[in-house]
Amino acid sequence: QRKRRNTIHEFKKSAKTTLIKIDPALKIKTKKVNTADQCANRCTRNKGLPFTCKAFVFDKARKQCLWFPFNSMSSGVKKEFGHEFDLYENKDYIRNCIIGKGRSYKGTVSITKSGIKCQPWSSMIPHEHSFLPSSYRGKDLQENYCRNPRGEEGGPWCFTSNPEVRYEVCDIPQCSEVECMTCNGESYRGLMDHTESGKICQRWDHQTPHRHKFLPERYPDKGFDDNYCRNPDGQPRPWCYTLDPHTRWEYCAIKTCADNTMNDTDVPLETTECIQGQGEGYRGTVNTIWNGIPCQRWDSQYPHEHDMTPENFKCKDLRENYCRNPDGSESPWCFTTDPNIRVGYCSQIPNCDMSHGQDCYRGNGKNYMGNLSQTRSGLTCSMWDKNMEDLHRHIFWEPDASKLNENYCRNPDDDAHGPWCYTGNPLIPWDYCPISRCEGDTTPTIVNLDHPVISCAKTKQLRVVNGIPTRTNIGWMVSLRYRNKHICGGSLIKESWVLTARQCFPSRDLKDYEAWLGIHDVHGRGDEKCKQVLNVSQLVYGPEGSDLVLMKLARPAVLDDFVSTIDLPNYGCTIPEKTSCSVYGWGYTGLINYDGLLRVAHLYIMGNEKCSQHHRGKVTLNESEICAGAEKIGSGPCEGDYGGPLVCEQHKMRMVLGVIVPGRGCAIPNRPGIFVRVAYYAKWIHKIILTYKVPQS
């Protein structure tokens, strides 16, 4: 049995809209159905309808179709907002251009090329003919409109009202001539709905015949309307998935507009001093990468051959050797003048100040009701009502729906680190918003820091100085490699996740990094049997000011005798003073004949007040920090083991309670180390692990 074609692609959808007839003479037909697709099929075939169907409304609440012989452009009709309604109008009746020979044209042009008025199809005056509406059902030979019922060369035509001229073609442009784009069409929002080879585009809100990630509700600013050609991913020009099961996608034939004929509404905001979002609109003159190496000119092929040329990226301002982001990378970058370093990121360019006026929140922001709808990295928030399923997955109560309006930043899950929102980016399902706590707000998010209220247990290169070589297997210890050299430590907290410090990432190019697991020697000597080398697939930066990064591995680590995970503490817990803990690290350790083995230094927990005294009152610790002092003078972390763990034991369970970060001195006698308190960020860590997709092994 031949599969009936899905005709919903032939309709233009207007969400939350219905049509109200002012003229009572206009007919409509209704019927209960399950889907809008069923309505569309019946409308297209006019099956069982006493009129030519030009549009329909699908009532989602009542599961009902309303078929109309009119559309929103007809007289005697008005549009009305309605949450439960979606209006679908047959494109053929609202299109003012033709595709191919114009066989499907059903517009209202009724004048020929030379300006003669058309003769009505039902009339035999002045010209007798056999093109009767009754003989050409479905060809819409209505009134005196230009039509091409037989699909002849030359396009739509009509018999003319001039007795001297029997028939003439009408001057209706090809849609490909009407439609135009600027640059590579990223801001194109036109109505082209077929590819350059004539294939009909698949609707963006459909997953057949091709499954895809570009869901309209996930990407509200990409213009994924109906089945129109778009360029959401920086391709050379707009494209679409096709209805041909054998052709997944194809480009669309849209010409470039003559200068200044189009308003580019969606071009990224241009900045010259700082980066907004991913920096696609950065037009400044920084021309070195993060470490000072100069950039190669974009129009040069030396020392690096490439095809990211000004000709290929006409609107990306690839001038001189300035840092740019023509391809949707994480941030502006360039090819470098060092033959050994192909690409470098210009991460020294500051982010534009994203704080929005006086917007601020109190406590943890659970009552924040402002209208900011952008994440700290500049991504547009996606609508809460499209993400309720995801929200329910990680909270165990019913969120207050009255607060979750539109796509505004909110805190429905009582996150300790402030308002956040879901994004339209599948790689970054959610992120925090750039709102600060209100000045003077001292509401703590965790109380009684120095008293054991909650138990922690659930049932220059940084190095450990003067530590003891470890002989026991510490399988959760990770050596983060940058361009094949050890740069930082880290802790494996889940098969696909490493907890480390944000200072460990001088470049934004993830290809520069690897994680080595199961090793004891920093060079991997003698560890061949137990070593696992894994690529890095994503960095998730911690809440503002945390200095933490969760590093996602490209594939899960295999847990064995040499590689294991370490537990996280309970959120907001405190560990008793004098608890014995350890820090771990590789690198130069103050010994001339350093052997490259993993070292451990033993420390003990110190309360924040006492810690501050040891720092002569120059340091005030807050709820996000934990302090540990050395049992042995001059033993502790130093520049190079950043990202490594402070590990403590409680109730026979070892946990990572702190992360080593720079800026607090290096193994100074009587000067305890200050670490990032993992317990303060435990909920954030669990939320990331729960909500970010990881590769399956």
């Epitope: 350059e196 480009y251 040329t309 290929n312 391809d327 090819f335 690409v343």
Partner: nanobody
Framework: EVQLVESGGGLVQAGGSLRLSCAAS????????MGWFRQAPGKEREFVAR????????SYSDSVKGRFTISRDNAKNTVYLQMNSLKPEDTAVYNC??????????????????RGQGTQVTVSS
């Protein structure tokens, strides 16, 4: 997707010439950077030549520079490799490949999303 079909290979005497063609279907080649690669028996695949989309930028491996010329005819959706002064060491299976512009080196075979099956070129002495 893009389907690439090479033709024009064959047996030729040293010093002779051949013109390889790479015809595409499924997409217009004008949007793609096109490369030619070759692999001799028991050897690594090596880069031969490439031509950019959007501009007449070409590059060649040192071993073929001055003897081979890469060109494209967008109207015919075809890329060519004109091979002159052929040597026995040019014997290999020649592949054409297509990619959209990317940060990766155009000499890196793995950066090309679409690849043909190859055509055999044999140069006898």
């Amino acid at each position: 997707e893009v389907q690439l079909v090479e033709s024009g290979g064959g047996l030729v005497q040293a010093g002779g010439s051949l013109r390889l063609s790479c015809a595409a279907s499924g997409r217009t080649l004008s949007d793609y950077t096109m490369g030619w690669f070759r692999q001799a028996p028991g050897k690594e695949r090596e880069f031969v030549a490439r031509i950019n989309t959007g501009g007449p930028i070409t590059s060649y491996s040192d071993s073929v520079k001055g003897r081979f010329t890469i060109s494209r005819d967008n109207a015919k959706n075809t890329v060519y490799l004109q091979m002159n002064s052929l040597k026995p060491e040019d014997t290999a299976v020649y592949n054409c490949a297509a990619r959209l512009p990317t940060k990766m080196s155009p000499r890196d075979y793995s950066s090309y999303a679409y690849r043909g099956q190859g055509t055999q070129v044999t140069v006898s002495s």
